[in-house]
Amino acid sequence: GGGGSKHKCFRNSLENNETLESIMNTLESEEDFRKYFYYLEGSK
């Protein structure tokens, strides 16, 4: 056996990540992404 998938980074998902995907689609730039993830970190 290999289990090769565990070494792979996927750009899409087998599950419904609708909420996150819809947020991602509204972020227009790399800077927006950074701000959003900083916000997520701060809210933990």
Epitope: G1, G2, G3, G4, S5, K6, K8, C9, F10, R11, N12, S13, L14, E15, N16, N17, E18, E21
Partner: antibody
Framework: EVQLVQSGGGLVQPGRSLRLSCAAS????????MHWVRQAPGKGLEWVSG????????GYADSVKGRFTSSRDNAKNSLYLQMNSLRAEDTALYYC?????????????????????WGQGTTVTVSS | DIQMTQSPSFLSASVGDRVTITCWAS??????LAWYQQKPGKAPKLLIY???TLQSGVPSRFSGSGSGTEFTLTISSLQPEDFATYYC?????????FGQGTKVEIK
């Protein structure tokens, strides 16, 4: 030879359960995600479920969510679809399929959902 | 969900004809599109993925093009074994969705 051999279909009454099986050979089964796709009589193709190599990620179509459960046994090179609370609209030919796990050299990421090997199909008829 | 629409739904053609099938996505899917061929009583067969990459073993008379929302499958010279139903499918995002199919029949 890369092959997927299906079993477990049949006639079942509404509300009852059925389990489909898919036996894989000719490739490293636990390297790949797998899928179930169905085709109602005279209709097109509909994705039902997908499961990652280690069952860590499992997705379902809204039409079957909460009723169907996809699982796999990598030691047995087998994929399963447990179908509960069956409805007349679940009547279809069910296919298992292997995911290619396509690598896009431009982005450096893999993508799910390209199905490059298919089983022969098994018929599920839900009727009283 | 992303809706996939194919045109035409039915197509009558003769051996040797050049055949083009179009597929539209309800939103941009980059080049994340696959084409499948299905013959009566048989499982679908992958023909093309990533909009234009020919699957191993598929004859070169098949080709695909397009990106974004509009895609085409072309058969440069239709052969007797090509009479079948063809489906496009987006693999951009969950859930994967198929077009309704295009049945290529003998004229």
């Amino acid at each position: 030879e890369v092959q997927l051999v299906q079993s477990g279909g049949g006639l079942v009454q509404p509300g009852r359960s059925l389990r489909l099986s898919c036996a894989a050979s000719g490739f490293t089964f636990d390297d790949y995600a797998m899928h179930w796709v169905r085709q109602a009589p005279g209709k097109g193709l509909e994705w039902v479920s997908g499961i990652s190599w280690n069952s860590g990620s499992i997705g379902y179509a809204d039409s079957v969510k909460g009723r169907f459960t996809s699982s796999r046994d990598n030691a047995k090179n087998s994929l399963y679809l447990q179908m509960n609370s069956l409805r007349a609209e679940d009547t279809a030919l069910y296919y298992c399929a292997k995911d290619m796990e396509y690598y896009d050299i431009l982005t450096g990421y893999y993508s799910y959902y390209i199905m490059d090997v298919w089983g022969q199909g098994t018929t599920v008829t839900v009727s009283s | 969900d992303i809706q996939m629409t194919q045109s035409p739904s039915f197509l009558s053609a003769s051996v040797g004809d050049r055949v083009t099938i179009t597929c539209w996505a309800s939103q941009g899917i980059s080049s994340y599109l696959a084409w499948y061929q299905q013959k009566p009583g048989k499982a679908p067969k992958l023909l093309i993925y990533a909009a234009s990459t020919l699957q191993s073993g598929v004859p070169s008379r098949f080709s695909g093009s397009g990106s974004g929302t509009e895609f085409t499958l072309t058969i440069s010279s239709l052969q007797p074994e090509d009479f079948a139903t063809y489906y496009c499918q987006q693999f951009n995002s969950y859930p994967p969705t198929f077009g309704q199919g295009t049945k290529v029949e003998i004229k």
